[in-house]
């Protein structure tokens, strides 16, 4: 056959759907690869063709659109399953073509099973709520296009395994779930089950997301350098190892880049000839505040090194701070036989 622009297997769009539930999958060509939409393509005489490769098979085969009750169908640029079966898992290809043009892309579809508490291998989206904020809402995701606006579905919300009713600060409001003055105990997996009728049948859509309660921007502060500080002096003799920790606390800030770095005599350690190593560790609080520690290490410090300026720097979206470490050379203890004896007039 003639040449076709093959975009390959689009693994960025690893689509997961639940077994025995409706699924509508849009051909990724129009969303991510081509500069025109399906309507334009269709009116230009292009045809959209679907086929698939079953899991653990190499053979591409056409999709059977003649199954009982139209279990699999195509509508414009959407492939419909009403509902899915476990063995629908595989790589699906949509191809747009006419006599002079051809473009296609494949994508993996995984049909997954869930247990009675909605646990499954499904990758869950994470929704962050700010601690103690007044009202915050999550919305049952990815249910658009499954039923017309004239159909009024029933929506049931669950936290973990438990139906949400009479929860003190979590209130189901149709497609939305409202959190009043969120606490860390609101962390968890929340599931909406949307039930709707279609052609005398009842379908269920299950959508689970993870809620993570994080620090509020209202409480956010610029980075706080706990170490080095004015109370600790790093007193070393030449030849000893110099270890200086830089420990910085960062308030949680959505999409903020937290940075910690050392300068030695105003330069980055990479830009100087000293044999210095820096090791970093990061820990997080329950509200995702962050503590970063960078330990500056000089294995065998010289008297020149002990005269240098060692400054810890930190930056977040809230501001930039810096703190110098107090480094000095240890004065050697006097040797009695020489220094002290001389002091007493001994010869």
């Amino acid at each position: 056959s003639e040449r076709c622009d093959d975009w390959g297997l689009d693994t960025m769009r690893q689509i997961q759907v639940f077994e025995d539930e409706p699924a509508r999958i849009k051909c990724p060509l129009f969303e991510h690869f081509l500069k025109f939409n399906y309507s334009t393509a269709h009116s230009a005489g292009l045809t959209l063709i679907w086929y698939w490769t079953r899991q653990d098979r190499d053979l591409e085969e056409p999709i059977n659109f003649r199954l009982p009750e139209n279990r699999i169908s195509k509508e414009k640029d959407v492939l419909w399953f009403r509902p899915t079966l476990l063995n629908d898992t595989g790589n699906y290809t949509c191809m747009l073509r006419n006599t002079t043009y051809c473009s296609k892309v494949a994508f993996p579809l995984e049909v997954v099973q869930k247990d009675s508490c909605f646990n499954s291998p499904m990758k869950l989206p994470v929704h962050k709520l700010y601690i103690e904020y007044g009202i915050q809402r999550i919305t049952c995701p990815n249910v658009d296009g499954y039923f017309p606006s004239s159909v009024k579905p029933t929506i049931t919300w669950y936290m973990g395994c438990y139906k949400i009713q009479n929860f003190n600060n979590v209130i189901p409001e149709g497609m939305n779930l409202s959190f009043l003055i969120a606490l860390i105990s609101n962390n968890g997996n929340y599931t909406c089950v949307v039930t709707y009728p279609e052609n005398g049948r009842t379908f269920h859509l299950t959508r689970t997301l993870t809620v993570k309660v994080v620090g509020s921007p209202k409480n956010a502060v610029p980075p706080v350098i706990h170490s080095p500080n004015d109370h600790v002096v790093y007193e070393k003799e030449p030849g000893e190892e110099l270890l200086i920790p830089c420990t910085v606390y960062f308030s949680f800030l959505m999409d903020s880049r937290n940075e910690v770095w050392w300068t030695i005599d105003g330069k980055k350690p990479d830009d100087i000839t000293i044999d210095v190593t820096i090791n970093e560790s990061i820990s997080h609080s329950r509200t995702e505040d962050e503590t970063r520690t960078q330990i500056l290490s000089i294995k065998k410090v010289t008297s020149e090194d002990l005269k240098r300026s060692y400054v810890c720097h930190a930056r977040s979206a809230k501001g930039e701070v810096a703190k110098a470490a107090k480094v000095k050379q240890k004065v050697p203890a006097p040797r009695y036989t020489v220094e002290l004896a001389c002091g007493f007039g001994a010869t």
């Epitope: 103690e132 904020y133 600060n169 009043l180 003055i181 860390i184 105990s185």
Partner: antibody, heavy 118, light 107 residues
Amino acid sequence: EVQLLESGGGLVQPGGSLRLSCAASGFIFSHYGMSWVRQAPGKGLEWVSAISYDGEGTLYADSVKGRFTISRDNSKNTLYLQMNSLRAEDTAVYYCARFRYYTAFDYWGQGTLVTVSS
Amino acid sequence: EIVMTQSPATLSVSPGERATLSCRASQSVSSNLAWYQQKPGQAPRLLIYGASTRATGIPARFSGSGSGTEFTLTISSLQSEDFAVYYCQQYNNWPWTFGQGTKVEIK
């Protein structure tokens, strides 16, 4: 110095209404959640209601839900509790308290006595 | 709601002695537990939050421990001003709930 000063308590008949106020000073009022906690004579402490720093989120104990309304005016640094359909069992000293998730109720007012009796 | 149970209801201790107060939650509250002291005619005062962190200005003789469902407030050497009622309170879940209180009285 953080100060919370309640007012508005008094004697009211069953079924009556009362509005408590709590004037706050010594901290940025609009940064903190606030609560009302009550204590019936000779009894323990009972959380009544909470309001978020922005006034949008409000929570109530089941015993007062539908009868009490918590609100705040951040421009006046004042917290309110509107109490309707009062019952004899609402008789208590009502305290306002500042809260943070990390530190619970860290500051309390001195309380105002509400007596519901015919 | 989470039920907080304190024991004993009353604790009789001599000044200078150690006092140990217990608080149990009906389900885990992690370390989101506070202790308050209340003297007659006064408002409660925060002593301990986060199960073990002393609030500002609280003497070192007060210490808290525990996590999950079992918590303890210890007063290492009772002073005359420590005789009062002590309440534990969970702030893990709404509604925030208090224990019924332990009265520490002079023996």
